[in-house]
Amino acid sequence: EEELQVIQPDKSVSVAAGESAILHCTVTSLIPVGPIQWFRGAGPARELIYNQKEGHFPRVTTVSESTKRENMDFSISISNITPADAGTYYCVKFRKGSPDTEFKSGAGTELSVRAKPSAPVVSGPAARATPQHTVSFTCESHGFSPRDITLKWFKNGNELSDFQTNVDPVGESVSYSIHSTAKVVLTREDVHSQVICEVAHVTLQGDPLRGTANLSETIRVPPTLEVTQQPVRAENQVNVTCQVRKFYPQRLQLTWLENGNVSRTETASTVTENKDGTYNWMSWLLVNVSAHRDDVKLTCQVEHDGQPAVSKSHDLKVSAHPKEQGSNTAAENTGSNERNIY
């Protein structure tokens, strides 16, 4: 009579995480008498998955009635598969004795687990950067299997090419992680821009996962300043404005200096927003020129988003304005951003 063979017909089985895996095993003879055991792995590192004879294996059920004497099908079903269940499973026949001895093993079935990658998380630099600078963004996704994965970077729908990607670990593992770093050159128009990391994997059925970062959290657009003198508003009064244009973020403090001395400090509040997401703001001073014998140097000094101050000055020619007797009293304030200089 031909000796018993242990047949594991499937070289490999692939299952999605959370599903059940069926591992097939049949024997060709009822002799010798003895139990079947299933192991994940072989040798010292093996793990007992199922013992026909004894034990409690809550996730394992037999496909056929393995307790029947004439049964030769020892296939099992393992429920709620996770990536940790991946490995080679061996169906092993034992010869009954004291103790039972290993008689023969099947060739093994490799179980691979398809696990979805986590939602990509995109993070940008810790500090803001200005236009024309290159900044790095990182994208991470974890827990996927198999190892093959595709990652792409986009800026406003345009694919980026300057990036480096690593999938870890390099060797075999139950699941994998991907880490990618992309370099992006900032422009003044990037306040509304988005950087997108897109991950495609066999488990996602052609519907990739995306992670985004808004460049509004990364960019700093420094303001441009323009100080202008408006036409005389009233006798001996000059209106001087400081136009603060195209800045982002909004955090901005403006200080007026009169001949180098602080006259007033204010914080940008009622700003106007441009189409590109940057802001404009205007501050103005009402200057009573009759109170001055000499020319006045007015300086608009702006501190934007905690950066070193930038300033623009304007020389007010006092001699160009006729002085009236007794006009050295303060002019009346008529606006929230007005200031008289005595």
Epitope: E3, G43, P44, R46, Y90, V92, F103, S105
Partner: nanobody, 118 residues
Framework: HVQLVESGGGLVQPGGSLRLSCAAR????????MSWARQAPGKGLEWVGA???????VYEKSVKGRFTISRDNAKNTMYLQMHSLKPEDSARYYC????????????SGQGTLVTVSS
């Protein structure tokens, strides 16, 4: 008592071949499943493959198609024929009188050292 003596190791270039032997005494060799395992420096013991009394074999995935286990019951000897050797096959190789279910303590011999290097 069980005695296992491994031999045949040595230095071989990548892509080369080597044949290891395991001479057994002190148990019924012809009725016993036998296996090979290996241990690279600083790593754990890794099972390589097994052979049963009827000559049927089982292999670990990374060696399948490159390694062949055979036995000569008349000589109480098991063999491991290794082809297309890679640097990662470098290890001390041990044999045991068990197959899939061999435990660390079953690999009781001194082992034989295989070094794959150019």
């Amino acid at each position: 008592h069980v005695q296992l003596v491994e031999s045949g190791g040595g230095l071989v270039q990548p892509g080369g071949s080597l044949r290891l032997s395991c001479a057994a005494r002190g148990f019924s060799f012809r009725d016993s499943a036998m296996s090979w395992a290996r241990q690279a420096p600083g790593k754990g013991l890794e099972w390589v493959g097994a052979i049963y009394s009827d000559g049927s074999t089982v292999y670990e995935k990374s060696v399948k198609g490159r390694f062949t286990i055979s036995r000569d019951n008349a000589k109480n000897t098991m063999y491991l024929q290794m082809h297309s050797l890679k640097p990662e096959d470098s290890a001390r190789y041990y044999c045991a009188p068990k197959g899939v279910v061999a435990d660390e303590g079953d690999y009781s011999g001194q082992g034989t050292l295989v070094t794959v290097s150019s």
